[in-house]
Interface confidence: low
């Protein structure tokens, strides 16, 4: 069974950014160069992550925290903490094991991640399509035909959305 | 990690063509875009063309346009490049090279060339 | 076709010299430039790519910088295996394209 650490426990008074030195009868020493504790009481500290090759340092190591890393422009984190760098493609692109390949008729992305999405079916909500679709931008629906009829006020497309943020270039 | 490894050397007359090999070993040549170079005698690096994504035809260099052909028998994972009507100014050495192939496990792909085939040296002489 | 244009075309330095090699695009390519080490009889190895990431088991004397158009490879302190051609290449358009190489020679 784990012990309790009992309130004397002189570990429990060293803060972040140290740990306590079994070695040294319980002292709380400083985390040597490239490593950190983010909270009190460690008896170790962790080595700081390292950003190299594709990884870029975001954020640097301090004592009480870890580095953080992002990506070298033309390329964008994947996973938690930006655990991996996947390359960046051209908007009408997705990335495939093989590399950047165009959207094939009908799908379109309008990011550099990401894969290739269907066109909005505008009859599904009994639309018409205002605008055609492009391998990088989804068709713009507008009112439905019967809407179009003579004498029937004339609607204005809505505006495009915001471009959604990119990686760094 | 992954290695190619090419065809030897071939001497070839004018009008011929030769195909030349590229054996990949340590991963599946599905799994890999194996793109061809090639640098005659002292000069520069050349791209001839090569496999981009998945599913579709190799692209092709302009210059090299209905003379080359590139395919793939990923049953015995082997890239061929094959270059027809030579004329003396195709001597060079020939070089398999995998493209967007992350050889290090770091997680990235992207558009460069690594690793390389040894070279496989072509010359075209009457 | 992105036109790549090195300079110089070729170098004399000694061992231990700080050498810096250039390399230009056509129109700008982010940062989709990679550059390659290559000594005769030999293929190009990959040094750096995406223009400033240093390949795995590549020297940490090699460094790239720059992005757009404008782009350079350093080596802080050449050492004798230094010596070779390199070749900087865009990989932002088809065809890629390489520049037509710096040969670093021994002074």
């Known amino acids: 069974f784990e012990r309790t650490r009992s309130l004397q426990d002189p570990c429990s008074n060293c803060p972040a950014g140290t740990f306590c030195d079994n070695n040294r009868n319980q002292i709380c020493s400083p985390c040597p160069p490239n490593s950190f504790s983010s909270a009190g009481g460690q008896r170790t500290c962790d080595i700081c992550r390292q950003c190299k090759g594709v990884f870029r340092t975001r954020k640097e190591c301090s004592s009480t925290s870890n580095a953080e890393c992002d990506c070298t422009p033309g390329f964008h984190c994947l996973g938690a903490g930006c655990s991996m760098c996947e390359q960046d493609c051209k908007q009408g692109q997705e990335l495939t094991k093989k590399g950047c390949k165009d959207c094939c008729f009908g799908t379109f992305n309008d990011q550099k991640r990401g894969i290739c999405r269907p066109w909005t079916n505008c009859s599904l909500d009994g639309k018409s399509v205002l605008v055609n679709g492009t391998k990088e931008r989804d068709v713009v629906c507008g009112p439905s035909p019967a809407d179009l009829s003579p004498g029937a006020s004339s609607v204005t497309p809505p505006a495009p959305a915001r471009e959604p943020g990119h990686s760094p270039q | 990690q992954v290695q190619l490894v090419q065809s030897g050397a071939e001497v070839k007359k004018p009008g011929a063509s030769v195909k030349v090999s590229c054996k990949v070993s340590g991963y599946t040549l599905s799994e890999l875009s194996i793109h061809w170079v090639r640098q005659a005698p002292g000069k520069g690096v050349e791209w001839m063309g090569g496999f981009y994504p998945e599913d579709v035809e190799p692209i092709y260099a302009r210059k090299f346009q209905g003379r080359v052909t590139m395919t793939e028998d990923t049953s015995t994972d082997t890239a061929y490049m094959e270059l027809n009507s030579l004329r003396s100014e195709d001597t060079a050495v020939y070089y398999c090279?995998?493209?967007?192939?992350?050889?290090?496990?770091?997680?990235?792909?992207?558009?460069?060339?690594?690793?390389w085939g040894q070279g496989t040296l072509v010359t075209v002489s009457s | 076709d992105i036109q790549m244009t090195q300079s110089p075309s070729s170098l004399s330095a000694s061992v231990g010299d700080r050498v810096t090699i250039t390399c230009r695009a056509s129109?700008?390519?982010?940062?989709?430039l990679n550059w390659y080490q290559q000594k005769p009889g030999k293929a190009p190895k990959l040094l750096i790519y995406a223009a400033s990431s240093l390949q795995s088991g590549v020297p940490s004397r090699f460094s790239g910088s720059g992005s757009g158009t404008d782009f350079t490879l350093t080596i802080s302190s050449l050492q004798p295996e230094d010596f070779a051609t390199y070749y900087c290449q865009q990989s932002y358009s088809t065809p890629p394209t390489f520049g037509q190489g710096t040969k670093v020679e021994i002074k």
């Open positions: 129109q700008s390519i982010s940062s989709y």
């Open positions: 090279a995998a493209e967007g192939f992350d050889n290090y496990g770091s997680g990235i792909r992207g558009n460069w060339f690594d690793p």
